[in-house]
């Protein structure tokens, strides 16, 4: 049940008042400073007012400090993502200070409860920091709160309570029920940090959302589009259907944000990227993988700061296991002209050729409709690092691969009986990568052969003037 | 050092139930969960649930949910496992275990207590 | 739940040889990998936690790899107290599960 004192209650204090029977009552929040990577290490306990433990335990007062927030738990064990985040930390920041936040007692309740219990862990937390500012050397500059789940609004509470502002809030798929379309002081938002970087991975548009839709942060990152995680489906997951349920796969999408951050820690010669666009469907549509402007960055601990006036909502693909970085290409096709086009939208598949690795075939997904006489714009990515482009091979799949192409091709032919046969005419192909801001335009191998039709495909190579730079900086000079 | 003491075997009939207890020293009982494990003869080990002993939270293997409760006295440091509705198959070594920090691995195990269900 | 694998329910290896075991999970669980060593009539020991992390008292003589779903214990000189028979656990989703056991017997 909800701890039962006012929104501005002190959880100690509540807490520590000696009951007429002198019983020791037990704080309901616990901050567990992590001394070792050894998970068999009892870690140290600190607590407002007690000095002793931050000198026994070595916590250093010049270095960041990281509060790992869990969110609200079916279990009264933590879940396995802690263990893993919290040793990414200490091997990437080794001096740093890695404190976990255990409010389980609070946490393993209903979970309208436990929301209920959010304000007042965030003021413990706020609380806890406020001591520590006490101290000398210590600035809440070098504070970075990492919230999972229901832990992102404790931690938007802490920000808010705190005197001052801490450094960095990273929101790790907040929660979504009880907080979507709440007002800016009862969830996440980005007057709660110097710097609030959020990453969505569990948003559903119907059915109920674990995670938040609406951008909460200076930056919301919705990686593959901030739904469907790939690895996470049904077959992935259950691997047999009689050993799992739904559950998992709702584990699974909903914690990726923990393993997507663990993977920026423990990666860093492998950083993933994202793009700012207004909505997944036009990133689907390649449209938008520009760095100018600030409009890319890096996921997860290596994100640059950004403070801007909007929130930026950003994304970008993934893999279905780390390492999770992709290689983003916007593939930009001019169809000038075509023929007998009927009502079926071709299915295209690309394969890249570089001068490190050639692709696997990759389909261009078609997100409205292929227009003529236009450019038509589109995303494929692959999952290794293909070098410099050398050529390109565009095949237009032959056969109908579902029961509603095929009723649409007999009905063409019902109202088209003598159908000449379906063409594109395609002279060329301009790729961008949206990992390295390089353009490149392909052109026909045969100049004169620009037609392609079901079952057949076009080669593409690298035209006469080459790549092409426009003022873009690379994502991979610029960011750390 | 850290000790996990076990109550003594048992010997049920089935239908009954029989309660476990895990006497834990060596170390701060409240900080660490506590897990029961058993083993049928011949059979791979099972793990059942686990206890928080600082505020008394459980998990619980769904296979066992409806027949097993874990419980602890804090001040006592002991965990108990009680299981009902026995039957022929509850036949087993049961075991406590101590969790790591975030409660994945067992350093330390109690000794075992054998579970025998027989009419 | 997830289902750990140990495809050899028996392997046969002589004193100061190397014993490669194995163990595969069902489904991807990163590091979440823990090994035990149990001899008749005695409790499980501990080897190896989260995959390849040594435990202290443990003879460095056993090690462990492997992320995802592929994971491998190897003894590299066995001595005598080594023959037993070896599990792998997994604490990547409840409920925690353990593989079926290998018996290392004396060749």
């Known amino acids: 049940s909800p701890v039962p004192f006012g929104p501005e209650g002190r959880l100690e204090d509540k807490l520590h008042k000696p009951k007429a029977t002198q019983t020791e009552v037990k704080p309901s929040v616990r901050f567990n400073l992590r001394t070792s990577k050894d998970p068999e290490h009892e870690g140290c306990y600190l607590s407002v007012g007690h000095s002793q433990p931050l000198e026994d335990c070595s916590f250093n007062m010049t270095a960041k400090t990281f509060f790992i927030i869990h969110g609200w738990t079916m279990s009264g064990i933590f879940e396995n993502w802690l263990h893993k985040l919290v040793s990414a930390l200490h091997t990437r920041e080794k001096d740093a200070n890695v404190v976990v936040v255990d409010w389980l007692p609070l946490a393993h309740q209903l979970y309208t409860d436990a929301v209920n219990n959010t304000r007042v862990v965030g003021h413990s937390i706020a609380r806890m920091l406020d001591w520590l500012q006490e101290k000398d050397d210590f600035s809440l500059g070098n504070v970075h709160l990492i919230g999972y789940s229901l832990g992102a609004h404790v931690a938007g509470y802490a920000g808010n309570f705190v005197k001052g502002t801490v450094g960095r809030i990273t929101g790790l798929d907040p929660a979504g029920p009880m907080f979507e379309g709440a007002d800016i002081h009862k969830r996440l938002s980005p007057d709660d940090a110097d710097f609030v970087d959020v990453l969505h991975t569990y948003t559903r548009s119907f059915g109920l959302s674990i995670g938040i839709q609406m951008p909460v942060g200076h930056i919301d990152i919705y990686p593959n589009g901030g739904d469907f995680q790939p690895g996470c489906g049904l077959n992935d997951v259950l691997g047999s259907i009689a050993y799992g349920t739904i559950t998992e796969v709702v584990k699974c999408e909903h914690e990726r944000a923990v393993h997507l951050f663990v993977d920026s820690l423990v990666n860093q010669d492998k950083p993933s990227f994202a793009f700012q666009c207004t909505d997944s469907n036009r990133f689907k549509k390649g449209i938008c993988l520009s760095c100018r402007k600030n409009r890319c960055n890096s996921i997860g601990y290596n994100a640059k700061k950004m403070r801007n006036k909007r929130n930026s909502k950003m994304y970008l693909k993934t893999r279905a296991g780390m390492p999770f970085r992709v290689y983003h290409y916007q593939m930009k096709i001019h169809v000038f002209s075509y023929k007998n086009m009927g009502e079926i939208e071709p299915t295209f598949y690309v394969t890249l050729y570089g001068t490190n690795a050639d692709s696997q075939t990759l389909p261009l997904e078609i997100v409205e409709r292929i227009e003529q006489n236009a450019t038509n714009t589109f995303l494929v990515y692959t999952e290794e690092d293909l070098g410099d482009l050398l050529k390109i091979q565009l095949t237009w799949e032959g056969a109908s691969q579902s029961w509603y192409n095929l009723w649409k091709e007999f009905r063409s032919y019902l109202s088209q009986p003598r159908n000449p046969g379906r063409e594109l005419n395609i002279r060329r192909i301009r790729v961008k990568s949206g990992e390295t801001q390089r353009k490149l335009t392909f052109c026909t191998e045969d100049p004169e052969n620009t037609s392609i039709s079901p079952g057949r495909e076009l080669w593409f190579r690298k035209c006469r003037d080459g790549w092409r730079m426009k003022n873009e900086t690379s994502p991979t000079v610029e960011l750390p | 050092q850290v000790q996990l003491v076990q109550s003594g075997a048992e010997v049920k009939k089935p239908g009954a139930s029989v309660k476990v207890s895990c006497k834990a020293s060596g170390y701060t009982f409240t900080d660490y969960t506590m897990h029961w494990v058993r083993q049928a003869p011949g059979q791979r080990l099972e793990w059942m649930g686990g206890?928080?002993?600082?505020?008394?939270?459980?998990t619980y293997n769904e296979k066992f949910k409806d027949r097993v409760t874990i419980t602890r006295d804090t001040s006592a440091s002991t965990a108990y496992m009680e299981l009902s509705s026995l039957r022929s198959e509850d036949t087993a070594v049961y075991y406590c275990?101590?969790?790591?920090?975030?409660?994945?691995?067992?350093?330390?195990w109690g000794q075992g207590t054998t579970v025998t269900v027989s009419s | 739940e997830i289902v750990m694998t140990q495809s050899l329910a028996t392997l046969s290896v002589s004193p100061g040889e190397r014993a490669t075991l194995s163990c595969r999970a069902s489904?991807?669980?990163?590091?979440?990998l823990h090994w035990y060593q149990q001899k008749p009539g005695q409790a499980p020991r501990l080897l190896i936690y989260y995959a390849s992390q040594s435990i202290s008292g443990i003879p460095a003589r056993f090690s462990g790899s492997g992320s995802g779903t592929e994971f491998t214990l190897t003894i590299s000189s066995l001595q005598s107290e080594d023959f037993a028979v070896y599990y792998c656990?997994?604490?990547?989703?409840?409920?925690?599960?353990f593989g079926q056991g290998t018996k290392l017997e004396i060749k």
């Open positions: 275990a101590k969790g790591d920090y975030y409660g994945g691995s067992y350093n330390y």
């Open positions: 206890i928080n002993p600082y505020y008394g939270g459980t």
């Open positions: 656990q997994q604490s990547n989703s409840w409920p925690y599960t």
């Open positions: 489904q991807d669980i990163s590091n979440s």
